[in-house]
Interface confidence: low
């Protein structure tokens, strides 16, 4: 999906008002574990591409993020503020339902959510050149 035509300010507002808190809640209890930010992005559409990938694509060691509160709110924000986004996700959602697993918070998931925090921060940062 091409995120170029999203309403970035509305997504920024959604992130600030709810998604950021849900990410913090998910990470709470990690004893100041420091994960290095290895995933980055260079502009707002690129950031959303990386955010979508990390949030909704299962990875080795972490298959359970899509049902987390921050993920559901991310999906809602993208569906509302990115024209045509929801249509592209119908097939992906159906596939995800088939492989839905028990919710388990693994260290790998915590690392992935830490990367997500970094990506959202870069999306939200005022220094970012808007493409």
């Amino acid at each position: 999906y091409d995120f170029t035509n999203c309403d970035f300010e509305k997504i920024k507002a959604a992130y600030l008002s709810t998604i950021s808190k849900d990410l913090i809640t998910y990470m709470s209890g990690t004893k100041s574990t420091e994960f290095n930010n290895t995933v980055s992005c260079s502009n707002r559409p690129h950031c959303l591409t990386e955010i979508q990938s990390l949030t909704f694509n299962p990875t080795a060691g972490c298959a359970s993020l899509a049902k987390e509160m921050f993920a559901m709110k991310t999906k809602a924000a993208l569906a509302i503020w990115c024209p045509g986004y929801s249509e592209t996700q119908i097939n992906a959602t159906q596939a995800m339902k088939k492989r839905r697993k028990r919710k388990v918070t693994t260290n790998k998931c915590l690392e992935q959510v830490s990367q997500l925090q970094g990506l959202w921060r870069r999306f939200n940062r005022p220094l970012l050149k808007q493409q």
Epitope: L16, S17, S20, S32, N37, G118, N124, R125, P126, L127
Partner: antibody
Framework: QVQLQQSGPQLVRPGASVKISCKAS????????MHWVKQRPGQGLEWIGL????????GLNQNFKDKATLTVDISSRTAYMQISSPTSEDSAVYFC??????????WGQGTTLTVSS | DIQMTQSPASLSASVGETVTITCRAS??????LAWYQQKQGKSPQLLVY???TLAEGVPSRFSGSGSGTQFSLKINSLQPEDFGSYYC?????????FGGGTKLELK
């Protein structure tokens, strides 16, 4: 716990550049922006600029573009602000503060800079 | 640049009173506003962010409200430790700017 420890008070001559430090501990240094804020005696707060420790990219208030230089040293988890050609107008307390979303949840204790001949 | 106009500049009140400080932005900043308290010789402390969310550890007698261009900070039943200076700050776009401050003094 999160701490931002700033360098001590400095007395400098006009024109002699000065560097203030802010050492972070208790959190992931590269996840948060580091900001610098100026407060002149008896005055309000003025945003100087910010730096992203993850890549060293900085953004400055236009009022400070020829005055302040922001840098970080990830290995020592320290942010720096250099003030060039200081004058009496630069005499102030300078704070570092961390931010994830634009508001400052932790502040350094402040560094008093006095510019006097 | 977005200008933040805070009022009143100073305010005298007694312990137990309720006070309200207001902040006006020169353009729409949605809910991108924070409030800080600063005691003499100390660093500012975050009270409220996102216009109305109370920061961790802040007593419930503090409350923030507003969105768009008009915001306010209300302190119910003032306590002796509440006296000091208060600042609003927007973080919608750079440069982030602060209000001029409100000095809350004991009557």
């Amino acid at each position: 716990q999160v701490q931002l420890q700033q360098s001590g008070p400095q007395l400098v001559r006009p024109g002699a550049s000065v560097k203030i430090s802010c050492k972070a501990s208790g959190y992931s240094f590269t996840t948060y922006w580091m900001h610098w804020v100026k407060q002149r005696p008896g005055q309000g707060l003025e945003w100087i600029g910010l730096i992203d420790p993850s890549d060293g990219e900085a953004g400055l208030n236009q009022n400070f573009k020829d005055k302040a230089t922001l840098t970080v040293d990830i290995s020592s988890r320290t942010a720096y602000m250099q003030i060039s050609s200081p004058t009496s107008e630069d005499s102030a307390v300078y704070f570092c503060a961390r931010s994830l979303d634009g508001y400052y949840d932790y502040w350094g204790q402040g560094t008093t800079l006095t510019v006097s001949s | 640049d977005i200008q933040m106009t805070q009022s009143p500049a100073s305010l005298s009140a007694s312990v137990g009173e309720t006070v309200t400080i207001t902040c006006r932005a020169s353009e729409d900043i949605y809910s991108y506003l924070a409030w800080y308290q600063q005691k003499q010789g100390k660093s500012p402390q975050l009270l409220v962010y996102n216009a109305k969310t109370l920061a961790e550890g802040v007593p419930s007698r503090f409350s923030g409200s507003g969105s768009g261009t008009q915001f306010s900070l209300k302190i119910n039943s003032l306590q002796p430790e509440d006296f000091g200076s208060y600042y609003c700050q927007h973080f919608w776009s750079t440069p982030w700017t602060f209000g001029g401050g409100t000095k809350l003094e004991l009557k």
